[in-house]
């Protein structure tokens, strides 16, 4: 039977009255333009809503914006536009919300053309009050908070100046000119690239990479001939132009740019690109674009130094035109990533890895689904997930895949079941085990969100017609109940819930359209009375993650350890609560060769788990140098996979080889680096 129509469905009784008492409507007293929402802080209940309306006149654009504040998760809003002197706020900069629970907010205002600088409104009390500050520059980017200290802000100006504030935007100082890109690193460090001659675009590949660790008092040039740079986990990456031609290569530093190593990755030409898909403190997923406008490339995974890379996935979809990739970190289960590959026939297929890129497979066909017409075999096919690429192609997919770290194992996504992604109307599928198995959850496209750490899933149909119904499930999407939240249907634009999936409130956003006007409206529904009691010990069950063969002693071992979780039983209708913490019990596994990758100069022959020394270290792909200078490189041929915690078992040892004579690099050696002070 279809999802939600099962006789055994554990229905929530009398839910209509319970939800009706907890449904709060707010009509925004302005014309429908655009609306943006921001949560200020975690568990504070404070939401800021900025509505903007543009009227393009002949000579200029007339704009109007309004600012609203809620402190009860969106049940009630107060118009606080007067706190910002009724100023028009620039939506392209959004609302810059401070890190953690700093309560800081920066709004960037639109100012008239002739002014000396821009204007910002600053709040450090969760938007209760704002201070107007006129800037000595016109901002080009949103204000960026230092992750370590929310009083420290940086911004780029339209004149390419790098500006820093040490007192939360009260005073600003230009610390450098001719800056292209700036990023906060750790410990209040700022990394930025500068151009010497014409402009950022003209000097691409001839930029310098600079660092300041004292907010602009002193500087150090840590790289030259830079094309671009990026930060991921504890790694600093720079793509650097080669001496002889127009190709460039990735260099990596793990000490904030003091020393660099050339990454063992293919070099790329002018039309190609590198992209850091994901990074943590252990390793990096790097996409290297294929030559030509193919729309695909190769994923490589790094070792713990970010230097040695293993080929992970071929023909990885990543369009050059729109810059779209479907690469998704499934945050509800360790080691799981989903992405798309481009087949020879130009169709798109979904692949999943459960071991951080070690092996990729197709997604298992959902039990309750039939293969669509893309399938060559009616009974054998896979689930293919619609993500960023499908959204960019307007394939009737309103949302990307969704997973939350505190809703263990749950993944929700639009998909089609066949040999490839289909252009037919997608359905919504759910996995409760991190992507190993899937079930059709809802027919047709929907918006969806996870509440109460997975205790409730809420969905709304994606339709061009006005809607007045939402659906909710208390058993991880097996059974659904519908609630009519208003008599008058609205044109639905989205579901909004507090980031982190701990809340029990959901806001339904949309607009009403009458003969003359259309207005924004929100309905906030609190599900607290649906989940009447707090969950107890009996409501949870033990679940072994990554379990595929319970008979096997090593069952569940991924990256050297297995984890048992306490998970809410599907039949339990209770509150995990805002303070819910995922309970997990890790246990270490014995090492096997699967827990090691081949070190530089070694490779794995196909269908062999042993690493064999490469006969010669020649070819661009293996140019390699440690810490920017020739150095005695010792290796036993194997390196533990980053993040792998296995112990005992197989412990491969190889004799030490001296590879220094084969080592080259064209990057800055430490003696070429220079420092200067302001």
């Amino acid at each position: 039977s279809a999802p939600g129509e099962d006789e055994e469905c554990g229905r929530v009784r009398d839910f209509v009255a319970k939800l009706a008492n907890n449904t709060h409507q707010h009509v925004f007293d302005d014309l429908r333009g655009s609306v943006s929402l921001s949560w200020v802080g975690d568990s504070t209940g404070v939401i800021l809503v900025l509505t903007t309306f543009h009227v393009p006149l002949v000579i200029m654009t007339f704009g109007q914006s309004k600012l609203y504040r809620s402190e009860d998760y969106g049940k009630n809003f107060k118009d606080i536009t007067d706190l910002i002197n009724n100023t028009f706020i620039r939506t392209e900069f959004g609302m810059a919300i401070g890190p953690e629970n700093s309560g800081k907010v920066v709004l960037t205002a639109e100012v008239s053309g002739g002014s000396r600088g821009g204007r910002i409104f600053r709040s450090s009390d969760f938007a209760k009050n704002f201070v107007q500050t006129d800037l000595p520059f016109h901002p080009l980017t949103q204000m960026m908070y230092s992750p370590q200290n929310s009083d420290y802000l940086l911004a780029l100006s339209t004149e390419n100046g790098l500006w820093v504030s040490k007192n939360f935007g009260g005073k600003w100082e230009e610390i450098h000119k001719a800056v292209c890109l700036a990023k906060w690193g750790s410990d209040n460090t700022i990394f930025f690239t500068t151009y010497a001659n014409g402009s950022c675009k003209a000097d691409l590949g001839a930029l310098e990479l600079w660092r300041t660790s004292d907010l602009g008092k002193s500087f150090k040039t840590i790289g030259v001939k830079i094309y671009s740079f990026g930060l991921g986990g504890r790694f600093l990456f720079a793509s650097v132009m080669a001496d002889k031609d127009t190709t460039r290569r990735i260099h990596v530093s793990t000490d904030q740019g003091d020393t660099w190593s050339m990454a063992q990755l293919p070099s790329v030409g002018q039309e190609q690109f590198y992209s850091i898909l994901a990074a943590n403190d252990d390793m990096v997923f790097m996409h290297v674009d294929e030559p030509g406008d193919t729309g695909f490339g190769t994923i490589f995974t790094s070792d713990d130094r970010g230097i040695v890379y293993s080929k992970s996935l071929d023909r990885h979809l990543y369009t050059t035109t729109g810059g779209e990739t479907d690469f998704t970190n499934v945050t509800s289960l360790r080691g799981v990533y989903i992405t798309s590959v481009l087949s020879e026939d130009n169709s798109i297929q979904t692949m999943i890895t459960f071991d951080q890129g070690g092996r990729w497979t197709h997604l298992r066909k959902p039990e309750n689904s039939e293969c669509d017409a893309t399938a060559k075999n009616k009974n054998e096919c896979s689930l293919h997930i619609h993500a960023s690429y499908s959204i960019s192609q307007k394939l009737n997919v309103p949302m990307a895949p969704l997973s939350e770290p505190n809703a263990v194992g749950i993944v929700i996504a639009h998909g089609s079941v066949g040999d490839a992604i289909s252009v037919m109307v997608p359905d919504v599928y759910i996995s409760d085990d991190g992507g190993y198995s899937w079930t059709k959850m809802l027919e047709g496209p929907h918006y969806y969100t996870i509440l109460d750490s997975g205790g409730i899933i809420v969905a709304a149909e994606h339709s061009s017609r006005p809607i007045n119904v939402i659906k909710f499930s208390t058993d991880e999407g097996q059974c659904w109940q519908t609630y009519t939240f208003t008599r008058d249907p609205i044109y639905f634009t989205g579901l909004a819930s507090e980031p982190g999936a701990r809340s029990m409130n959901i806001s339904i956003w949309g607009f009403t359209e009458s003969f003359l006007t259309s207005q924004w409206v929100s309905y906030t529904i609190d599900f607290k009375d649906i989940l009447e009691r707090n969950c107890e010990e009996k409501d949870y069950t033990i679940w072994l993650a990554h379990s595929t063969d319970p008979e096997d002693y090593e069952d569940g071992c991924i990256l050297g350890y297995k984890e048992q979780f306490l998970r809410l039983r599907k039949s339990s209708v209770c509150q995990n609560g805002r303070d819910y913490v995922v309970t997990k019990q890790p246990s270490i596994c014995l090492c096997s060769l699967e827990d090691f990758l081949c070190d530089f100069g070694y490779y794995r022959p196909e269908n062999d788990s042993k690493c064999v020394e490469q006969p010669e270290l020649k070819g661009h792909d293996l140019e390699f140098c440690l810490y920017g200078r020739e150095e005695h490189l010792t290796t036993n041929g194997y390196r533990k996979i980053p993040g792998d915690k296995c112990q005992g078992g197989v412990n491969p040892v190889r004799e030490v080889k001296d590879l220094k004579k084969k080592c080259t690099s064209n990057f800055l050696s430490p003696e070429k680096q220079n420092s200067k002070s302001n």
């Epitope: 406008d293 193919t294 729309g295 695909f296 979809l317 369009t319 050059t320 035109t321 481009l342 087949s343 026939d345 130009n346 169709s347 798109i348 039939e370 293969c371 669509d372 017409a373 893309t374 399938a375 060559k376 075999n377 009616k378 096919c381 499908s390 192609q393 307007k394 394939l395 009737n396 066949g418 040999d419 490839a420 992604i421 289909s422 252009v423 037919m424 109307v425």
Partner: antibody, heavy 129, light 107 residues
Amino acid sequence: QVQLVQSGAEVKKPGASVKVSCKASGYTFTSRYMSWVRQAPGQGLEWMGIINPVGGSTSYAQKFQGRVTMTRDTSTSTVYMELSSLRSEDTAVYYCARDPSGIAAAGPASRYYYGMDVWGQGTTVTVSS
Amino acid sequence: EIVMTQSPATLSVSPGERATLSCRASQSVSSNLAWYQQKPGQAPRLLIYGASTRATGIPARFSGSGSGTEFTLTISSLQSEDFAVYYCQQARLGPWTFGGGTKVEIK
């Protein structure tokens, strides 16, 4: 030459089912998808769904989901369309049409649509009590 | 689903004249569009595919243009056998959808 020959007219009572056949000849049967399109009296064309003759897998328009079943027999190069729980609104001419393009979403190279290039002569289905 | 809107519903043209038929999609269909001709009591016949390519055996007086949401079928000089109903159809997103048709009749 390439042709699609459909079964003869049918008269059915409401609630009954009808099964229309479409025999392909003059080309490799498994090399092209087959769509079914219907046309109510005096109305326009309405697409019902598509079948992949290679494995017999199907995709249906949501409107017909649960009521329509498309199958094929490769030994006779024939596709079938069965519509159940018939109502008077199902009175129409039903066409099979060769649909070369399939339904896989294109990657970055644009998908190219070749159109339904060969049609059956149509089967009239009348639903009346 | 993508809604295809054809205009005009009826077009009265004299033989030898030019006929221009319009088809609009509710969202972009790229060039995944076909035009069909249907005469009374007959099955539709493919005229144009890929928005602008003539199907095999279709006379040169039929031409298709457009991409995205706006498409045109032009019959440069109407012959007596061209009086029929013309349908556009998109295959960008499932379900495939047809326009309501334009009837080209003798003026």
